[in-house]
């Protein structure tokens, strides 16, 4: 496909498009992870995810079903992304006794410390509550060593789930997640519906929440959630996540219930002008002359920094790799070394607008 050509100034220098010689026209370049539905896509709607909703592309390039968090005792920890499964964890007030890949096979309620004992470590999604004697002296509850053991997860008659606290304030909206990943409320301190395919957590005490109408029987607690591709901002409003649909960007972290999607420059490019949650301007990764020394960093970061040659020498960097290989993308801090005079203005091509969102993020909301 022509969109696999190296990144270059085609179609009036618009990186979101490429020129297809076969059809003799400018075509929209589908973002990474999306496939065109026709030979020469004209708009984002002509691009589709590689996998169906609720499937992700695994290491073997197969579309694999994301795990579901639809069991009543599970909540979604991280959403199903194009290249990674959804991850579930035990809902607040419960811990995992039998783990499973990207999920938990068995959740139990956190134990309540018996009389004479206090919480040493509160329960988490992974661990049960750990109790300790209330005072240095041995309390009646600890008369026998048996009573001082951490209760076994299966036999805790006094265990109680974390109480559900009602939302009190009244904001203008309180959307639920919809679309291909409609979800039931499964927030911290909230219960969730058994029938929901996935869940996205919301704190029950978020500012700007208003109680909804009661839910149908068995559907759990309805509280503020946002539609897909929206997150709950600091003011308690559902706000659009930035999109990474510019061809030179890839998704770094997905759009989550309380944070925007973040984008970074695609491999082979570095960020010349950074922006909140994204990069306003990516430039081709430079190939530097012999006198520029490459200094490897921690491989986990997959970053490379460039050390300037001794004073008096001039590094000679080509704008594009000559061998066609693209190193991993780099952080904005490195890019300043490469392009310290990077323009702070953002060109806005007419066919693929880029704008700064209300949080200063560049948004190319092209779908």
């Amino acid at each position: 496909f022509p969109q696999d050509r190296p990144f270059e100034d085609t179609c009036h220098g618009n990186p979101s498009h490429y020129y297809d010689k076969a059809v003799r026209r400018c075509c929209y370049r589908c973002p990474m992870g999306l496939f065109p539905t026709q030979q020469c896509p004209q708009r984002p709607t002509d691009c589709r995810k590689q996998c169906e909703p609720d499937y992700y592309l695994d290491e073997a390039d197969r579309c694999t079903a994301c795990v579901t968090c639809s069991r009543d005792d599970l909540v979604e920890k991280t959403p199903c992304a194009w290249n990674s499964s959804r991850v579930c964890e035990c809902r607040p007030g419960m811990f995992c006794s039998t783990s499973a890949v990207n999920s938990c096979a068995r959740c139990f309620f956190h134990s309540v410390c018996p009389a004479g004992m206090i919480v040493k470590f509160p329960g988490t999604a992974q661990k049960n509550t750990v109790c300790e004697p209330a005072s240095p002296g041995v309390s009646p509850a600890c008369a026998s060593p048996e009573n001082c053991k951490e209760p076994s997860s299966g036999t805790i008659p006094q265990a109680k789930p974390t109480p559900v606290s009602p939302a009190t304030s009244s904001a203008s909206t309180m959307p639920v997640r919809g679309g291909t990943r409609l979800a039931q409320e499964a927030a911290s301190k909230l219960t969730r519906a058994p029938d929901s395919p996935s869940s996205v957590g919301r704190p029950s005490s978020d500012p700007g929440l208003s109680p909804t109408q009661p839910c149908p029987e068995g559907s759990g607690d309805c509280r503020k959630q946002c539609e897909p591709d929206y997150y709950l901002d600091e003011a308690g409003r559902c706000t659009a996540c930035v999109s990474c649909s510019r061809d030179d960007l890839v998704e770094k972290t997905p759009c989550a219930w309380n944070s925007s999607r973040t984008c970074e420059c695609r491999p082979g490019m570095i960020c010349a002008t950074s922006a909140t949650n994204s990069c306003a301007r990516c430039v081709p990764y430079p190939i530097c002359a012999a006198e520029t020394v490459t200094k490897p960093q921690d491989m986990a970061e997959k970053d490379t920094t460039f050390e300037a040659p001794p004073l008096g020498t001039q590094p000679d960097c080509n704008p594009t790799p000559e061998n066609g290989e693209a190193p991993a993308s780099t952080s904005p801090t490195q890019s300043l070394l490469v392009d310290s005079q990077a323009s702070k203005t953002l060109p806005i091509p007419t066919s693929a607008p880029v704008a700064l969102s209300s949080t200063g993020k560049p948004v190319l909301d092209a779908g």
Partner: antibody, heavy 123, light 106 residues
Framework: QVQLVQSGSELKKPGASVKVSCKAS????????IHWVRRPPGKDLEWIGY????????DYNQNFQGRVTITADKSTSTAYMELSSLRSEDTAVYYC????????????????WGQGTTVTVSS | IELTQSPSFLSASVGDRVTVTCKAS??????VAWFQQKPGKAPKVLIY???YRESGVPDRFTGSGSGTDFTLTISSLQPEDFAEYFC?????????FGGGTKVEIK
């Protein structure tokens, strides 16, 4: 193809309630939220709220909070919008709408609309 | 977020170039859609993400803008284009709409 078919016109007295239906077809009903929007004569379109048919959870614009109830019946793929304590300013064309399904992102602009239901509130 | 659309009314002739503007009270990125509505009909989406034409929409309709200022342009008005046009922001809930622009025959 996606279709949203709404119930017929309603004439109501002030203080009464009205329940408008929206039957969806051409897609899996539980996959998308159904939104309700109204347009009073000579005024702007106004977003009322929406329902998640999968969970039954609904959300409303603060302007309607307490007076509106949006529900959904999965068995018939129908969403309902009930507005109570009607007043003359509730006279409007009420629309149900569904967001688009396009590519990787799921922002809420409406590609599919019902034909509209005229609700007249008059004594 | 308030959307202020202008003009409210516009008289034009077939073949005219028509421009409608929509100003948001705060930054909405490019999260704006434009709709056309004819009397007795449901709105029809023309443009989404500020500048992308919906499939099947004639290329005489173009959208532009970002941040707070958006424009819908009809390059050469056709008889079927006489209708009302309005913008919608979907950046932040509650979703809001512009007041509409009625394009009438001169």
């Amino acid at each position: 193809q996606v279709q949203l078919v709404q119930s017929g016109s309603e004439l109501k007295k002030p203080g009464a309630s009205v329940k408008v239906s929206c039957k969806a077809s051409g897609y899996t009903f539980t996959t998308y939220t159904i939104h309700w929007v109204r347009r009073p004569p000579g005024k702007d379109l106004e977003w009322i709220g929406y329902i998640n048919p999968s969970s039954g959870c609904s959300d409303y614009n603060q302007n309607f909070q307490g007076r509106v109830t949006i529900t959904a019946d999965k068995s018939t793929s129908t969403a309902y919008m009930e507005l109570s304590s009607l007043r003359s300013e509730d006279t409007a064309v009420y629309y149900c709408a569904r967001r688009a399904d396009y590519g990787n992102y799921e922002y809420t602009w409406f590609a599919y609309w019902g034909q509209g239901t005229t609700v007249t509130v008059s004594s | 977020i308030e959307l202020t659309q202008s003009p409210s009314f516009l008289s034009a002739s077939v073949g005219d170039r028509v421009t409608v503007t929509c100003k948001a009270s705060q930054n909405v990125g490019t999260n704006v859609a434009w709709f056309q509505q004819k009397p007795g009909k449901a709105p029809k989406v023309l443009i989404y993400s500020a500048s992308y034409r919906e499939s099947g929409v004639p290329d005489r309709f173009t959208g532009s803008g970002s941040g707070t200022d958006f424009t819908l342009t009809i390059s050469s008005l056709q008889p079927e284009d006489f209708a009302e046009y309005f913008c919608q922001q979907y950046h932040t809930y509650p979703l809001t709409f512009g007041g509409g622009t009625k394009v009438e025959i001169k």
